[in-house]
């Protein structure tokens, strides 16, 4: 799977994680930090 960094406009899209662009799927994806979940890594779980 080819990945690259998200466009500058997506800075801040992922609240607690890193935004990556999945080229083959044409999708932005939030890779969440440990302890966070949700489309935008907005939910904290224990």
């Amino acid at each position: 799977v080819s990945i690259t960094k998200c466009n500058s406009d997506m800075n801040g899209y992922c609240l607690h994680g890193q935004c990556i662009y999945l080229v083959d799927m044409s999708q932005n994806y939030c890779r969440c930090e440990v302890g966070y979940t949700g489309v935008r890594c907005e939910h904290f779980y224990l």
Partner: antibody, heavy 116, light 106 residues
Framework: QDQLVQSGAEVKKPGASVKVSCKAS????????IQWVRQAPGQGLEWMGR????????KYREKFEGRVTITADTSTNTAYMELSSLRSEDTAVYYC?????????WGQGTLVTVSS | DIQMTQSPSSLSASVGDRVTITCKAS??????IAWYQQKPGQAPRLLIQ???TLQPGVPSRFSGSGSGTDYTFTISSLQPEDIATYYC????????FGGGTKVEIK
């Protein structure tokens, strides 16, 4: 099925304000950004601004700064674009556009006519 | 704001011709460019995103290329149904549309 359904056509007098709504179904607007784009008759496409409904953060094109207000009501899954001090040059079709995880998905457009 | 200079503003070509439209950005947009087709009375239709990724259902005669500040959109063999106005859109840093290219048949 994801959808963006915009409010109906409006006719306004110069100097008035207009508020266009954009109701999302099939997805949560908090997972997206909502952009607004307009197109005057016979003219090109013009980006106006956008909102991040989760953070409640907005960004506007410089030429619209102070005249446009983009808001979002996450309880009703609806975004709004209000344009004030209308002039005849604001006659256009106004589109809301979803961006975020997937690339852009457009609403059907709302015609706003400014005429005395 | 990033500026997008699209050329030509209009062109006339014969059925079967190769048609090329260019967009030049005022700064590097890191391949974050999309191309739209718009027919009269219709909303824009997304053809290509991320420079060269064709959307599902879009004919393979449409293609895109480029990097840095210079990008190209090509119709390899113009068909009557391709008569429309085409727009580039940079979405690296906020959004800016090119001025559009009206494609007509000779």
């Amino acid at each position: 099925q994801d959808q963006l359904v915009q409010s109906g056509a409006e006719v306004k007098k110069p100097g008035a304000s207009v508020k266009v709504s954009c109701k999302a179904s099939g997805f949560n607007i908090k997972d997206t950004y909502i952009q607004w784009v307009r197109q005057a008759p016979g003219q090109g496409l013009e980006w106006m601004g956008r909102i991040d409904p989760l953070r409640r953060q907005t960004k506007y094109r410089e030429k619209f700064e102070g005249r446009v207000t983009i808001t979002a009501d996450t309880s009703t899954n609806t975004a709004y674009m209000e344009l004030s001090s209308l002039r005849s040059e604001d006659t256009a079709v106004y589109y809301c556009v979803r961006s975020g995880r997937e690339f852009d998905y457009w609403g059907q457009g709302t015609l706003v006519t400014v005429s005395s | 704001d990033i500026q997008m200079t699209q050329s030509p503003s209009s062109l006339s070509a014969s059925v079967g011709d190769r048609v090329t439209i260019t967009c030049k950005a005022s700064q590097d947009i890191h391949k974050y460019i999309a191309w739209y087709q718009q027919k009269p009375g219709q909303a824009p239709r997304l053809l290509i995103q991320y420079t060269s990724t064709l959307q599902p259902g879009v004919p393979s005669r449409f293609s895109g290329s480029g990097s840095g500040t210079d990008y190209t959109f090509t119709i390899s063999s113009l068909q009557p149904e391709d008569i429309a106005t085409y727009y580039c859109l940079q979405y690296d840093n906020l959004r800016t549309f090119g001025g559009g290219t009206k494609v007509e048949i000779k």
